[in-house]
């Protein structure tokens, strides 16, 4: 039943059939076998790399972006490519690895509060207590199609991580996407293995912060595969 599957008190990595395999009578998720949710559908390992076709960056993993594999190649054929590290060339934020952004064609670290006062196309909705709008929550308004505003704060609805303030990423929460904190050292993280290995993530965690990677906690090496705890650890 849904209540056993979607109990929201913890982050869920649901196994098939909710990940999309056939035949579960209690499931009404419309999914194809092997698809991971919510859009990070290609967490390959190096030894099992398969190019994943995409139409936009959001269809790729947090360490990837969507582009044509060859410069000047067929624009209709795009795949998820590995993100660009600091000081590599870029054309947009999504090309740069987590913790970086694209500035003047180069991936640079985002730990300076570079987003303050930046002109943005998207209106970020605030979860503040200034109850001034029809729906009862505060909302920043705009004088024109572009506006100056601070990036989305924790809990703000977002479309992509570049909508969120420094130190936050855009991740799934229930059936929506909100800005959540990038994980700090010692915090539990989600290690995505290869494509098709996990199901519907109702509560997605952010990635580990700068200089950290998601690894099995040392004292959990002896635990069974399924119960291994991953935490953000120094490289």
């Amino acid at each position: 039943t849904l209540n056993s599957v979607l109990n929201s008190n913890a982050i869920k990595n649901l196994p098939p059939p909710l990940g999309g395999a056939a035949g579960h009578p209690g499931s009404a998720v419309s999914a194809a076998p092997g698809i991971l949710y919510p859009g990070g559908n290609k967490y390959q390992t190096i030894d099992n790399y398969q190019p994943y076709p995409c139409a936009e960056d959001e269809e790729c993993g947090t360490d990837e972006y969507c582009a044509s594999p060859t410069r000047g190649g067929d624009a209709g054929v795009q795949i998820c490519l590995a993100c660009r590290k600091r000081r590599k060339r870029c054309m947009r934020h999504a090309m740069c690895c987590p913790g970086n952004y694209c500035k003047n064609g180069i991936c640079v670290s985002s730990d300076q509060n570079h987003f303050r006062g930046e002109i943005e196309e998207t209106i970020t909705e605030s979860f503040g207590n200034d109850h001034s709008t029809l729906d009862g929550y505060s909302r920043r308004t705009t004088l024109s199609s572009k506006m100056y505003h601070t990036k989305g704060q924790e809990g703000s609805v977002c479309l992509r991580s570049s909508d969120c303030a420094s130190g936050l990423c855009c991740a799934r929460h229930f059936w929506s996407k909100i800005c959540k904190p990038v994980l700090k050292e010692g915090q539990v993280c989600t290690k995505h293995r290869r494509k098709g290995s996990h199901g519907l993530e109702i509560f997605q965690r952010c990635y580990c912060g700068e200089g950290l990677s998601c690894r099995i906690q040392k004292d959990h090496h002896q635990a069974s595969n399924s119960s291994r705890l991953h935490t953000c650890q120094r490289h």
Partner: antibody, heavy 114, light 112 residues
């Protein structure tokens, strides 16, 4: 202004189909999960279906599973509910609802009657 | 499904007097994000639900401050400090932490 406006309700015979629409405005529609909830005459509210922000994931109440289909068009800021094989017990006011920062529309009445 | 149980089912109140409605959930509505996904709303004939309180104790815009919510975990209360004639209707609690969203049976509030 921030609002949801449902349309498409009406009187329909049992076994027939109807498609409801919900037009969203004033907020980042494509970032929110959206739900349909209904209220039958003299009864309490009943949750019907949910669709994720990107349209990839959908869940339904057992009472409508296999008959109703929830969908969305983020380019048009619109949520849909395709209702097939309608029954008398589907008669209700149907509301679309935004999750997290809960917002409801004014509802549209569906009457299934021969 | 999470069962939401409201008491009392009806309440007759003198204008200016306080009123209190209880809602108990079959399991905790506290999420790991620290929020408790419990709402209160008012239903009047022919009108859509009018949401009063979100996340246990936060008032929606333009909701008079005579309405307040409290509680945690599985036990919640809606209080009206001084009932007014316009407050009549059916009050419901609702949880959205888990699918399907579920609702209390409703508490009919009327004026004496």
């Amino acid at each position: 202004q921030v609002q949801l406006v449902e349309s498409g309700g009406g009187v329909v015979q049992p076994g027939r189909s109807l498609r409801l629409s919900c037009a969203a405005s004033g907020f980042t529609f494509s970032g929110y999960g959206m739900h349909w909830v209904r209220k039958a005459p003299g009864k309490g509210l009943e949750w019907v279906a949910v669709i994720s922000y990107d349209g990839n994931d959908k869940y339904y109440a057992d009472s409508v599973k296999g008959r109703f289909t929830i969908s969305r068009d983020n380019a048009k800021n619109t949520l849909y509910l395709q209702m097939n094989s309608l029954r008398a017990e589907d008669t209700a006011v149907y509301y679309c609802a935004r999750e997290l920062r809960v917002l409801w529309g004014q509802g549209t009445l569906v009457t299934v009657s021969s | 499904d999470i069962v939401m149980t409201q008491t009392p089912l009806s309440l007759s109140v003198t204008p200016g007097q306080p009123a209190s409605i209880s809602c108990k959930s079959g399991q905790s509505l506290l999420h790991s994000d620290g929020k408790t996904y419990l709402y209160w709303y008012l239903e009047k004939p022919g009108q859509p639900p009018q949401f009063l309180i979100y996340e246990v104790s936060n008032r929606f815009s333009r909701v008079p401050d005579r309405f307040s919510g409290s509680g945690s975990g599985t036990d919640f209360t809606l209080r009206i400090s001084r009932v007014e004639a316009e407050d009549v209707g059916i009050y419901y609690c609702m949880q959205s932490i888990q699918l399907p969203w579920t609702f209390g049976q409703g508490t009919q509030v009327e004026i004496k």
